[in-house]
């Protein structure tokens, strides 16, 4: 039975040219996290973090995606095209698969604030 929940940073905004941390957290379960996949709005792969093999960063993003902190992902040199949904997929044992969603808005404004409160989707 899947008892866990994914908490995410929810809806966040960040400045064009800046960076943002995408973070999900699995709680309320003792399941072992074996792999976390990070995907972009069009479901294209950004990165994989395998518990035993480490990180795989999609090659086209390697110059502006940094692994971590933890199981999260840091997206750098943001462009307006980065606006959209991001998904974390947690493969766990024995529970199975959990999925979280984050919406990132990249703002032109120099006063853009990076809001990053955790929330349950």
């Amino acid at each position: 039975m899947m008892t866990g929940t994914i908490e995410t940073t929810g809806n966040i905004s960040a400045k064009k040219g800046g960076s943002v941390i995408l973070q999900c957290h699995l709680s309320s379960t003792m399941a072992q996290v074996t792999q976390v996949n990070w995907e972009q709005h069009d479901h294209s792969l950004l990165a994989i973090r395998n518990a035993e093999l480490g990180w795989h960063i999609y090659p086209a993003f390697k110059d502006r995606v940094a692994p971590g902190p933890g199981l999260g992902l840091t997206l750098q040199s943001l462009t307006m095209n980065d606006t959209g949904e991001y998904f974390c997929t947690y493969h766990t044992y024995p529970d199975g698969t959990y999925r979280g969603r984050i919406f990132l808005e990249v703002l032109e404004s120099s006063v853009a604030e990076h809001s990053a409160r955790f929330q349950i989707p």
């Epitope: 074996t34 792999q35 792969l45 994989i48 395998n50 518990a51 035993e52 093999l53 480490g54 990180w55 795989h56 999609y58 090659p59 086209a60 390697k62 110059d63 493969h91 044992y93 698969t97």
Partner: antibody
Framework: EVQLVQSGAEVKKPGASVKVSCKAS????????MHWVRQAPGQGLEWMGR????????KYNEKFKSRVTITVDKLSSTAYMELSSLRSEDTAVYYC????????????WGQGTTVTVSS | DIQMTQSPSSLSASVGDRVTITCRVS??????LAWYQQKPGKSPKLLVY???TLAEGVPSRFSGSGSGTDFTLTISSLQPEDFATYYC?????????FGPGTKVDIK
């Protein structure tokens, strides 16, 4: 065109070390992880480890962990695999293989380097 | 370690035949499975990754299916250049492991 060109065949004595090179071209070397896989004569494939050429960080198969070292030279776009304390059962073809776009599989392979361990 | 078994270990077939190779895995690997083709004296060639995605340049007569612990590689109409050994590999944990191979030869 992606190419992985490996160094030539080696004959080594038991207890010695061997260092195999793999020169990459046709793509951005630091953007793709590199794996090493070996194949004993008439046998299947055995994964040895992988490296991130950008950071130099590596992961190894526990079976080889104490004997294998995978390194890179970013300037020459070359990956290296060194295996120490060689024994006769290390006689095999050693392959470098580039990691694929979408995970930990390998999409391009070198031509292989035959390592023979014999007294 | 994740254990991989393949069946059959070898098969004889004719040009035009439909060929199916099975790979069974000791634990759930979701869809993280690749298939490779290897000809004698040559390096392995990637055919399929993520269980069903055809690698670039691979003919459409090849197809992969399955998830969890049971996977299949199908060649819809065997061609002369398809006689080779086929290996499955999980790409989900350390160590990455390969199946023992299935040799496809001419009947």
């Amino acid at each position: 065109e992606v190419q992985l060109v490996q160094s030539g065949a080696e004959v080594k004595k038991p207890g010695a070390s061997v260092k195999v090179s793999c020169k990459a071209s046709g793509y951005t070397f630091t953007n793709y992880y590199m794996h090493w896989v070996r194949q004993a004569p008439g046998q299947g494939l055995e994964w040895m480890g992988r490296i991130d050429p950008d950071s130099g960080g590596s992961k190894y198969n526990e079976k080889f962990k104490s004997r294998v070292t995978i390194t890179v030279d970013k300037l020459s776009s070359t990956a290296y695999m060194e295996l120490s304390s060689l024994r006769s059962e290390d006689t095999a073809v050693y392959y470098c293989a580039r990691e694929g776009h979408y995970g930990f599989y390998s999409d391009y392979w070198g031509q292989g380097t035959t390592v023979t361990v014999s007294s | 370690d994740i254990q991989m078994t393949q069946s059959p270990s070898s098969l004889s077939a004719s040009v035009g035949d439909r060929v199916t190779i099975t790979c069974r895995v000791s634990e759930n690997i979701y869809s993280y499975l690749a298939w490779y083709q290897q000809k004698p004296g040559k390096s392995p060639k990637l055919l399929v990754y993520n269980a069903k995605t055809l690698a670039e340049g691979v003919p459409s007569r090849f197809s992969g299916s399955g998830s969890g612990t049971d996977f299949t590689l199908t060649i819809s109409s065997l061609q002369p250049e398809d006689f080779a050994t086929y290996y499955c590999q999980h790409h989900y944990g350390n160590p990455l492991t390969f199946g023992p191979g299935t040799k496809v030869d001419i009947k």
